[in-house]
């Protein structure tokens, strides 16, 4: 029987700068029941606080709700593991909520083949930003990326859409069924997961010629 091994805080993420969650890996098992506690303080303060919510984020997590989340302060946090034989401490992690945002995927992905009479046909892709993100405040700039591929192809074709919420793609293989997905990221932060795939059948008469 041993004291617990050193834990490690390995990830913190926020969906929208209003709340965030951190997760840790437990250290090696000392062969005894182990209690974990996350304590934190804000930079410039000495007062230590304990994690407000160990439940919402699942096992080995700490969730900071709206009342505990401040965009303009760095959080310094540490996890303590304790069993009957002793304690171990993680390294401290410095967390700035601005830099840990990982939005939900974009919503309402719509894909349509457009065949104007006077111009080349194209694939028109449209989506909405995730609901948790409030773009009106100006706190956020969301960037988007689209990927698509024929159903049986191995390689994805990736297009960067910038801040647009719609995009046109001209070069497609006629008669193929395509999968289309979109994802987003804030200017500082992490890419969201890809949205669920939308399928679109490209007509056989879809022409790529001028």
């Amino acid at each position: 029987q041993l004291p617990p091994g050193k834990p490690e805080i390995f990830k913190c993420r926020s969906p929208n700068k209003e709340t965030f969650t951190c997760w840790w890996r437990p250290g090696t098992d000392g062969g005894l029941p182990t209690n974990y506690s996350l304590t934190y303080h804000r930079e410039g303060e000495t007062l230590m606080h304990e994690c407000p919510d160990y439940i919402t984020g699942g096992p080995n997590s700490c969730h900071f709700g709206k009342q505990y989340t401040s965009m303009w302060r760095t959080y310094i946090m540490m996890v303590n593991a304790t069993n009957q034989m002793g304690s171990s401490f993680s390294d401290e992690l410095y967390v700035d909520v601005t830099y840990i945002v990982q939005p939900d995927p974009p919503l309402e992905l719509a894909v349509e083949v457009k065949q104007p009479e006077d111009r080349k046909p194209y694939l028109w892709i449209k989506w909405s930003p995730p609901t948790l993100i409030d773009l009106k405040t100006g706190w956020f700039t969301l960037l988007y990326e689209i990927r698509l591929k024929p159903e049986k192809a191995a390689e994805w074709e990736i297009h960067f859409a910038g801040q647009q919420t719609e995009f046109k793609i001209l070069s497609l293989h006629p008669g193929q069924k395509y999968l289309v997905q979109v994802r987003c990221k804030p200017d500082h932060g992490y890419w969201s997961a890809w949205s669920p795939a939308t399928f679109i059948q490209i007509p056989s008469d879809f022409t790529m010629n001028d």
């Epitope: 041993l2 050193k6 171990s88 401490f89 401290e92």
Partner: antibody, heavy 120, light 107 residues
Framework: EVQLVESGGGLVQPGRSLRLSCAAS????????MHWVRQAPGKGLEWVSG????????GYGDSVKGRFTISRDNAKKSLYLQMNSLRAEDTALYYC?????????????WGQGTLVTVSS | DIQMTQSPSTLSASVGDRVTITCRAS??????LAWYQQKPGKAPKVLIF???SLESGVPSRFSGSGSGTEFTLTISSLQPDDFATYYC?????????FGQGTKVEIK
């Protein structure tokens, strides 16, 4: 420049006490855990004791538990080791070492050591 | 406590040799391992932390690898300044423990 300077070593009889000090400079002392490590003549390194930044957790090696007490004074940028009931096997060079973090990490700076000799 | 066992205890090598020192932990310690170099009459100096991260200012000929219970320190091309004693240390538990040391001497 980070500096750790140990003092308080000397010749002491078995069963007596000694207090070692470590004066720190060149860094924010209360941002780091601190430790005592010893080395008997011609032998390897042995961790003696450690204390986290705010004195909220203290640990001791098995061979000194119940006899040695570690403490720190952040205002004075000083680390201490109170050694009671000294034995011949406590004879060693005692190093003060800085932890690289506030809690539990590797030792990134060491002092030059102070020699403790326990002999009658 | 976690025991750390180093091998070999002594290693004779020449300048330019590739040198490997092994450290084995009695229990899994993840990657929480540091390597130190000590020269006679001097304090130890950290070379590697978290099993494979090179401490700032340490020459790149030093490298560390391993995780769990088996770790190695490698000096890719031994230099005259590298003849010293090397120690591994675990910091997986608050009670730190060192290996018994490996003395690298001139062949």
């Amino acid at each position: 420049e980070v500096q750790l300077v140990e003092s308080g070593g000397g010749l002491v009889q078995p069963g007596r006490s000694l207090r070692l000090s470590c004066a720190a400079s060149g860094f924010t002392f209360d941002d780091y855990a601190m430790h005592w490590v010893r080395q008997a003549p011609g032998k390897g390194l042995e961790w003696v004791s450690g204390i986290i930044w705010n004195s909220g957790h203290i640990g001791y090696g098995d061979s000194v538990k119940g006899r040695f007490t570690i403490s720190r004074d952040n205002a004075k940028k000083s680390l201490y080791l109170q050694m009671n009931s000294l034995r011949a096997e406590d004879t060693a060079l005692y190093y003060c070492a800085r932890d690289s973090g506030r809690y539990q990490s590797y030792f990134d700076y060491w002092g030059q050591g102070t020699l403790v000799t326990v002999s009658s | 406590d976690i025991q750390m066992t180093q091998s070999p205890s002594t290693l004779s090598a020449s300048v330019g040799d590739r040198v490997t020192i092994t450290c084995r932990a009695s229990h899994i310690i993840s990657s929480w391992l540091a390597w130190y170099q000590q020269k006679p009459g001097k304090a130890p100096k950290v070379l590697i932390f978290k099993a494979s991260s090179l401490e700032s200012g340490v020459p790149s000929r030093f490298s560390g690898s391993g995780s769990g219970t088996e770790f190695t320190l490698t000096i890719s091309s031994l230099q005259p300044d590298d003849f010293a004693t090397y120690y591994c240390q675990q910091y997986n538990t608050y009670s730190r423990t060192f290996g018994q040391g490996t003395k690298v001497e001139i062949k």
